[in-house]
Structures are given as C-alpha cells and as structure tokens.
C-alpha cells in the first residue's frame, strides 16, 4: 500500500502502486493515484491531473478535499458515497474541472459537508436536487454554510433552453434544504435578474455575492427577511438606480455592509432618493467612488457631489412635437 | 468571542497628554467602526467619536467638546484603537469606554470593554 | 444636536411589576423606515450593555421581559416583570446623526 504522509508532508501514491491495489478493498489510508494526501492536515489533493471521475479510493480521514482542474463532466448520483461514509468532509473544492452536469444527489452521503465549491465550470445540467438529494417537498436539511458558484454560467450555445437564473434557482431552493447556508457566491453569471422568492427561502445568510453580473434592477428582490446578512456584494452589475423600498430595506439590516462600486448609475430626476440616502448612510463601502454613467453631460459626476438641481429629467414632449 | 480590552488611563495634570489604547479580538476589526465613549464620575454617557471602517476609509467623527484636542486611530495589523488626548482637562475626567459598532453603524455599539479611567487633577 | 430627554429620573418598582421608561428626542431619529434609537443597561462598575437597537429589536441573549417601542421622536422601554437581577440604570442613545447623544438616564430600584 502507498504510504501515507507524516505531519509535515504530502504524500503522493504512485499510479502503478494504485493499480497494483485495485482489486482489493481500499485500505483505510492509502492515498488515490494522482493524487496528494496528508493525514496530518486530513487533506487529499487531486489537482490539475485531467482526472475523469472522482477516485474511489479516497481516505476515510479527508477533511479537505481539492479536486480542482480536471475533467469531469459528470457528477453522479453519490459521486461521492462511500462504504464507510466520508463522514469527516467538510470542504470539497470542485472548482475549474470542467463539469457540465451536477446530477441530483450528487452530494448525498457527505454529513460533514459545510463548504463546496463549484466555481469556474460550464454548469449546463444543475439538477433541481443537486443540493437537496431528494424531491421532496421538505428534504433534510444540508450541513452547507458555505456555497461557492461563481462563473458557472455555460457558453451561450450550451445553455438549454431555459433560464439560467431559473435553473440556480431551483437548486437553491429545492426541499428548503439549504436553509442553514450562511455564505452564496454567484459572481460573474451573466445573471439579468434575481427570482423574488431566492433570498427569503435562505434567511441564515451572512454573506452574498452578486458581483460582476448583468442586473438592471432590485426593484422585485427583496432583502427584508436577511436580517443575519454582513455582506451584499453588488460592484460590477448594470443598476442603474435603487429605489425608496430597497433603499429602506438595505438601511434597516443590522448587520450590512453593501458594495455597489462600478453601475452605470443613471443621473436623472430618478436618482434624487438614491443620493440623499447616499449623502448621510454609513452601510455604503466606498460611497465617494461611485459616479454618473448617463446621461452623457453627467458621465463620471460623483454621486455624493450631486444636489436635487443636477437631477433633471428631460420633458416628455407630445406625440405632435416629437422628431422620428 | 468579541473582547475589547482598554488600557493606558491614569492621572494626568491639565494641559498635559494621554494616549489610551483598545485591544480588541474575536472578529474582523478592519470591518468594523469603532468608537469612544466617555462617563465622568457618576454622570451619563457622552460620545466622544468614531473611526469607520477599511471600507469607507478609516474615517473619523469628533463631539464637538474634543474637536482639535483629541484624535482617534487605530492600527489594524494590532487589532488596536486609539484614543490621543491632548491639552486636557479637568472636564474630561472620566471613565474612557471603548466600542464596536454593529455591523450597519447607524445601530450603534454592541460590544464595549470595561473601561479605563482617566483623571485630569493638579 | 439632537438631545434625548428621558423621564422619569428615577422610578421605584415592585418585584415582579412593569418599568416603563421614556424617551423624546427633539427631532426625528427615523431614517428610511427604521428608528436608530437604542437602550442600554448600566450596572454599578460595569460598561453599557446593549438591550434594544432599532427601537424595538432585542439584543440577542437579552432576557424577553424586555421590550421596546416607539418611532420617530417618541420611545419607551419596557419591563414587563422586573427582576431583582434589573436594578441598574437605563439610557436612551440615538445613532441617527453625528454627533451620537445619549439621554441623561433612569435609576430603576426595588420599591
């Protein structure tokens, strides 16, 4: 059997010593074919190793599991159920592997699993029930707090033919089992939108991110029922304005810290709220870097410098008087 | 476990300067406001000033009563505020409390070390 | 400045009986919906404790004897059954404008 490392090290199993074990039943604490184990730190690395399928022999110890740049396409059903369980996981770090399925269930059996990342994979395929295992209506609840998905908005011509936002969604919320979750980043998808219903079914959040992403709007998101949330994560979007209802929503969390950096802010008669709530709250990071995007006469105006008389709307003129 | 543990009050003449320090532990310090809060001997509470957070600068705010007199800072590779008390006087006799902000500062203090007197006597 | 005028001073309460404690600010402390008005419990040689933020949330682990209401510029701290463990003084702060100010406090003891 391939030697396991001591406190300091990794150790790496040799291929032809894995192969020469395949056969038998995996020892406890024989590390995969290429892969990196330390017992010591309860870590197993398979990095960057074009691996096509999560090894079966994993060490029962793993406590922090990297299986990062490979090629896995498919993430099955019990990908990772074993005999005994892995019942020590507790970080599992997919990310960069090249999945484009995450089938239901991919995740069952893992009743330590508090961290996963799926980031930097074309997610074509994220089954309803990837997180929650079953379809049940009320699933048990998941052990995730943290839950890591940003970049994982396929190219265009994979998509199905259905919304991607609603496709994230549905894995979020399916069977309540992520109610517990505390950290959800969904930076860089190209999200548009966010469903009304996502953040009231994941009340324990502390920390979102939304950054880098297409949204317009806040008007039909609601953060009311966040009260836990630290961090909201919104630099990087195409908002425009916030409005008197988010704007009143986003003051009264007793936690909050919002960052709002690079929107094409629209400098009209429509951001007067926005700047006077800008003017005098605290739970703005970074207030005095944002500015003006449009109209052209107000590009790069700090917002915190605007009074009431620099927000005109240009009149609507009658049908009669209009130019085509 | 959030602590805030104050130090470096004493008695001091008037006229004379004092730096008081804060240790705190147990969270993020560069996210959060932290603030002074002063009591003299058997009075209310008095605001003396806050220090925002990375985000929005390390900013500060002052009462009026200390403006030009004392500064706040802090040194965030030590987890520290500090509090630099100059031309001081008999007025500020007090005891020096130190404060976290909650997370949205517009909630105020939620954590507060116990307290470091400061006496200002001929 | 906005100033916090709390009433009574003092107040002397039965075991077992409500404490009801005022607070007028002389303007608003309300910002975008919420009331930035706040209650802490000072006990003798002891720093502030937070009780009640926002006018009516209640700190976690405080006991929920203890309840808060109000908006705008008028406010009131409730106990609904003191406790011997209650005997110490309660200030009003307001967190809606610089400078923060805290009322002058009220002295709750046994009757």
């Known amino acids: 059997s391939s030697p396991t490392s001591s406190a300091s090290s990794f150790s790496s199993s040799a291929p032809f010593l894995a192969s020469a074990v395949s056969a038998q039943p995996p020892l406890p604490d024989q590390c995969p074919a290429l892969c990196e184990c330390s017992e010591a730190a309860r870590t197993v690395k398979c990095v960057n190793r074009n691996l096509t399928e999560v090894p079966t022999d994993l060490p029962a110890y793993v406590r922090n599991l990297f299986l990062t740049g490979n090629q896995l396409a498919v993430l099955p059903a019990g990908a990772f159920a074993r005999r005994p369980p892995l019942a020590e996981l507790a970080a599992l770090n997919l990310s960069g592997s090249r999945l484009d399925e995450v089938r239901a269930g991919a995740f069952e059996h893992l009743p330590s699993l508090r961290q996963l990342d799926l980031s930097h994979n074309p997610l074509a395929d994220l089954s309803p029930f990837a997180f929650s295992g079953s379809n049940a209506s009320v699933s048990a609840p998941s052990p995730l707090v943290e839950l890591i998905l940003n970049h994982i908005v396929p190219p265009e011509d994979e998509r199905q033919n259905r919304s991607f936002e609603g496709m994230v969604v549905a894995a979020l919320l399916a069977g309540r089992a992520l109610q517990g979750l505390r950290r959800l980043e969904l930076a860089s998808n190209h999200f548009l939108y966010l469903p009304r219903d996502v953040l009231a079914q994941l009340p324990s959040l502390r920390h979102l991110d939304l950054s880098n992403n297409s949204l317009v709007s806040l008007t039909y998101v609601s953060f009311r029922n966040l009260t836990h949330l630290e961090s909201l994560h919104l630099e990087d979007n195409a908002l425009k304005v916030l409005h008197n209802g988010t704007l009143a929503e986003l003051q009264g969390l007793p936690h909050i810290r919002v960052f709002l950096d690079n929107n094409p802010w629209v400098c009209d008669c429509h951001m007067a709220d926005m700047v006077t709530w800008l003017k005098e709250t605290e739970v703005v990071q970074g207030k005095d870097r944002l500015t003006c995007a449009y109209p052209e006469k107000m590009r790069n105006r700090v917002l915190l410098e605007l009074n009431s008389a620099d927000l005109d709307c240009d009149p609507i003129l009658p049908p009669s008087l209009q130019t085509s | 476990e959030v602590q805030l543990v104050e130090s470096g009050g004493g008695l001091i003449q008037p006229g004379g300067s004092l730096r008081l320090s804060c240790a705190a532990s147990g969270f993020t310090f560069t996210d959060y406001y932290m603030s002074w809060v002063r009591q003299p001997p058997g009075k209310g509470l008095e605001w003396v000033g806050f220090i925002r957070n990375k985000g929005n600068g390390y900013t500060t705010e002052n009462s009026a009563s200390v403006k030009g007199r004392f500064t706040i800072s802090r040194d965030n590779s030590k987890s520290t505020l500090y509090l630099q008390m100059n031309s001081l006087r008999a007025e500020d006799t007090a005891v020096y409390y130190c404060?976290?902000?909650?997370?949205?500062?517009?909630?105020?203090?939620?954590?507060w070390g116990q307290g470091t007197l400061v006496t200002v006597s001929s | 400045d906005i100033v916090l005028t709390q009433s009574p001073d003092s107040l002397a309460v039965s075991l077992g009986e409500r404490a009801t404690i005022n607070c007028r600010a002389s303007?608003?402390?309300?910002?975008?919906?919420?009331?930035?008005l706040q209650w802490y419990q000072q006990k003798p040689g002891q720093p502030p404790k937070l009780l009640i933020y926002?006018?009516?949330n209640v700190e976690s682990g405080v006991p929920d004897r203890f309840s808060g209401s109000g908006s705008g510029t008028d406010f009131t701290l409730t106990i609904s059954s003191l406790q011997a463990e209650d005997i110490a003084v309660y200030f009003c702060q307001q967190s809606r404008k610089v400078p923060s100010t805290f009322g002058g406090g009220t002295k709750v003891e046994i009757k």
């Open positions: 404060a976290r902000y909650r997370g949205n500062p517009h909630y105020a203090m939620d954590y």
């Open positions: 303007e608003s402390v309300e910002f975008y919906g919420t009331s930035f």
């Open positions: 926002g006018a009516s």
